[in-house]
Interface confidence: low
């Protein structure tokens, strides 16, 4: 028998330095956690220990922070580089620069090979990105060799930025004549490597023949065996055991996310590849394991060139800002309400006295905030800060919608509701009631807008046939988070301002904030 | 098996509105995009636009807009095409195409309806 | 629009004989490129998708080759069964647009 141990992270999200436990900036350094010098520390520990070790990372590390904020991802380069990662998997958020974004500061940059066998490059791009990324990698480990084969959600041309000339195949037709390949190169023993969710995941594990684990990404999964050490629930034990359709039981894991749990997985394969057991659990990155030295001292001499960002007060919080994923992607959250608040703020326009304003409503994708504020940090908000909460670098843009398409959207908003998905909508100016115990697209039982051809501003249904302007991100303008309709029915869309000036705007012009959750959502009785 | 059944035969009169429909079975409906293909009598086929059965989005040829409108109903798993102000020029076999892929984004339109006539007459 | 040159418009051969017919678009497609089959009354039948790429259950005398602008069809041994209208489409851009046809008889 032969023993691999396998290390992953998975959707770190820009997090180079420490953070607090729910992945927003560190306040009290005792308590942080996570950070790639943290990382590099369990890591080298891991990897004097045991003979045959595999660093792997399986996407998203781009986005996040104000790291890639200014660096633009040559960050992900040198620190990857630094931690000497064995592959990585291309996540949809390294798309989120362009090809070009991927291109300089990553794929050129990189010592590790860096995977996707889903993705398909055409036209002239084809020759330009050839050989920076690979459908699979064999890695010798030891005396043996181990194949790598990568996979990116198909869903990428939908969430980020890839342009026209990358086709994004089904992942699992897309990987079943690469595994083949490894077979018939007598490598034996093979990874898939991957970021389209923990439900991809499980099919790749039942459907690719060949395939031996399963390391993924993209849903932020948690799974842990045992008493979790952290606020994190478990979505099943670590690893997940899928049963192939051709009988094999295959190991499935995914690390939570931001750099907080280093995956830990140890896989005894015979010698024939077959793995004979499998076991392991994500580890908490505490502060009980130390930062590394050299790393962290590097990690500050980098940090230097993010301090103009970082350290002017825009205003004060006296309330936290709950942008959390378990709060926005599944109810009102006051980050939500802030966010839109300074959208319209920002569009304030009195040009006709027929209006109080040209525009009074707002939708924002809840998948868009990224992260909470914590008040506690003597309420200071800082641009750094709101990097982490929208750190797209999209803009917030003005278009004209029917009635009927807004209705499409908020139908759409809730057409999965309870999967944790982004396109759940935050609102301003909106006032919506969802019954959850309707089949999907008929869940609006209301949907009332603030007038804004009146002296006073009220609510008033929602009418079909009128057009509206609406407030949005240009993300949602642009079809993201399946919001097709309206990218398809837009009757006009300007492009507006930077996202993170409007709330850094609003938020020093008002000095000090206190948004508060305020029945903007709701939902009807015996749904919720 | 894989099955897109169309509806009858249309005879109607200029100026008047007409909607067909393309009943899929076989497949999740949701999951392919459903484009719509006209012919007319002895010439060759032209494109009118889609519809994705999973959101609702459509797309048009610029030559068919405002006279295609593409809606879909999940329930029945029934894509249609109702198409306004006919006049002769409309007289054609109207054919419903799934956008069917092999590796994801491989594309083709590999089943079709077997086609609705409809003829505008006074 | 991209526009689709279809050649020849129509043309006899005998059974046995190898056919090609092509196909030029006025820009380059990137061999996003479908050809169809059609009989007198019937609905479109799809043989080849992505320029090369047989659909399954369509006989292998069937082929397509071609990248760029130009495109072909090949009949490696023609059949009775082969007799009808082919189609070219293009889907690399917006609007989709087909070939006027091609109507193959029998010599």
């Known amino acids: 028998a032969w023993e691999l141990t396998i290390l992953h992270t998975n959707d770190v999200h820009s997090r180079l330095e420490q953070t607090s436990e729910d992945s927003s900036k560190c306040v009290n350094a005792s308590r942080c956690m996570g950070g790639v010098a943290r990382l590099f520390t369990k890591v080298q520990q891991i990897r004097r220990a045991e003979p045959n070790v595999l660093l792997l990372d399986a996407g998203d590390q781009y986005q996040g922070t104000i790291w890639f904020t200014v660096y633009k991802g040559a960050e992900v380069a040198h620190f990857m580089n630094a931690l000497r990662y064995d592959a990585m998997a291309l996540g949809n958020h390294e798309f989120d620069n362009g090809v070009e974004g991927l291109i300089e500061p990553l794929l050129k940059e990189a010592k590790f090979p860096i995977l996707s066998a889903n993705i398909k490059a055409k036209g002239p791009l084809a020759s330009q990105i050839s050989g920076l990324y690979l459908p699979y990698k064999v890695l010798p480990v030891g005396d043996e060799v181990v194949g790598i084969v990568g996979y990116t959600s198909k869903e990428t041309p939908f969430l980020s930025n890839p342009g026209t000339n990358l086709v994004f195949e089904d992942e699992i037709t897309a990987l079943q004549p690469e595994v083949d390949k490894l077979k018939t190169l007598n490598v034996n023993k093979i990874i898939a490597l991957g970021h389209s969710g923990f439900e991809m995941d499980k099919l790749i594990a039942q459907k690719v023949r060949g395939v031996d684990v399963v390391v993924g990404g993209h849903s932020n999964t948690f799974l842990y065996t045992g008493n979790p050490p952290s606020k994190e629930v478990p979505a099943g034990k670590y690893p997940f055991i899928v049963t192939s359709d051709d009988g094999r039981k295959v190991p499935v894991v995914q690390a939570y996310a931001f750099g907080k749990y280093l995956g830990y997985l140890k896989i005894e394969f015979d010698e024939r590849g077959n793995v004979i057991s499998s076991h392991g659990n994500p580890i908490l990155l505490n502060s009980s394991i130390p930062e590394d030295p050299s790393i962290k001292a590097d990690i500050n001499k980098w940090r230097i060139k993010l301090d103009n960002y970082s350290t002017q007060e825009l205003g004060k919080t006296i309330v936290y800002l709950d942008g959390s994923s378990q709060s926005c992607r599944f109810r009102e959250c006051n980050m939500g309400n802030l966010i839109c608040d300074a959208m319209i703020n920002n569009n304030l326009r009195h040009t006709d006295e027929m209006f109080w304003n040209h525009v009074s409503m707002c939708i924002l994708n809840g998948g868009g905030i990224r992260s909470p504020i914590d008040e506690r940090n003597n309420g200071t908000i800082t641009w750094e800060n709101l990097a982490a909460v929208l750190p797209f670098g999209g803009t917030f843009d003005l278009v004209q919608l029917k009635g009927s398409t807004l209705k499409k959207a908020f139908e759409h908003s809730v057409h999965r509701y309870g999967q944790s998905t982004g396109e759940f909508l935050q609102v301003g100016g909106i006032h919506v009631v969802y019954d959850l115990s309707r089949k999907p697209g008929d869940r609006v039982v209301k949907l009332d807008v603030l007038c804004t051809k009146c002296r006073v501003p009220s609510y008033d249904p929602l009418k079909m046939d009128e057009v509206y302007k609406v407030i949005l991100p240009n993300f949602l303008a642009n079809g993201g988070d399946g919001f097709q309709m309206i990218k398809d029915e837009l009757l006009r869309h300007d492009s507006g301002d930077q996202d993170i000036n409007v709330v850094s705007t609003y938020i020093s012009k008002m000095k000090v904030i206190y948004p508060a959750v305020e029945g903007r959502i709701k939902f009807s009785t015996g749904s919720h | 098996e894989v099955q897109l059944q169309q509806s009858g035969p249309e005879l109607v009169k200029p100026g008047a509105s007409v909607k067909m429909s393309c009943k899929a079975s076989?497949?999740?409906?949701?999951?392919?995009?459903m484009h719509w293909v006209k012919q007319k009598p002895g010439q060759g086929l032209e494109w009118i636009g889609y519809?994705?059965?999973?959101?609702?989005?459509?797309k048009y040829n610029e030559k068919f807009k405002g006279k295609a409108t593409l809606t879909s109903d999940k329930s029945s798993s029934t894509a249609y095409m109702e198409l306004s102000s006919l006049t002769s020029e409309d007289s054609a076999v109207y054919y419903c195409?799934?956008?069917?892929?092999?590796?994801?984004?491989?594309?083709?339109?590999?089943?079709w309806g077997q086609g609705t006539s409809v003829t505008v007459s006074s | 629009d991209i526009v689709m040159t279809q050649s020849p418009s129509s043309m006899y051969a005998s059974l046995g004989e190898r056919v090609t017919i092509t196909c030029k678009a006025s820009?380059?497609?990137?061999?996003?490129l479908s050809w169809f089959q059609q009989k007198p009354g019937k609905s479109p039948k799809t043989l080849i998708y992505?320029?090369?790429r047989l659909v399954d259950g369509v006989p292998s005398r069937f082929s397509g080759s071609g990248s760029g602008q130009d495109y072909s069809l090949t009949i490696s041994s023609l059949e009775y069964e082969d007799m009808g209208i082919y189609y070219c489409?293009?889907?690399?851009?917006?609007?989709?647009?087909f070939g006027a046809g091609t109507k193959l008889e029998l010599k």
């Open positions: 992505r320029a090369n």
């Open positions: 820009q380059d497609i990137n061999s996003y």
């Open positions: 076989g497949y999740t409906f949701t999951s392919y995009v």
């Open positions: 195409a799934r956008w069917g892929y092999d590796e994801g984004y491989y594309y083709a339109m590999d089943y």
């Open positions: 489409l293009q889907y690399d851009e917006f609007p989709l647009t």
């Open positions: 519809i994705n059965p999973y959101n609702d989005g459509t």
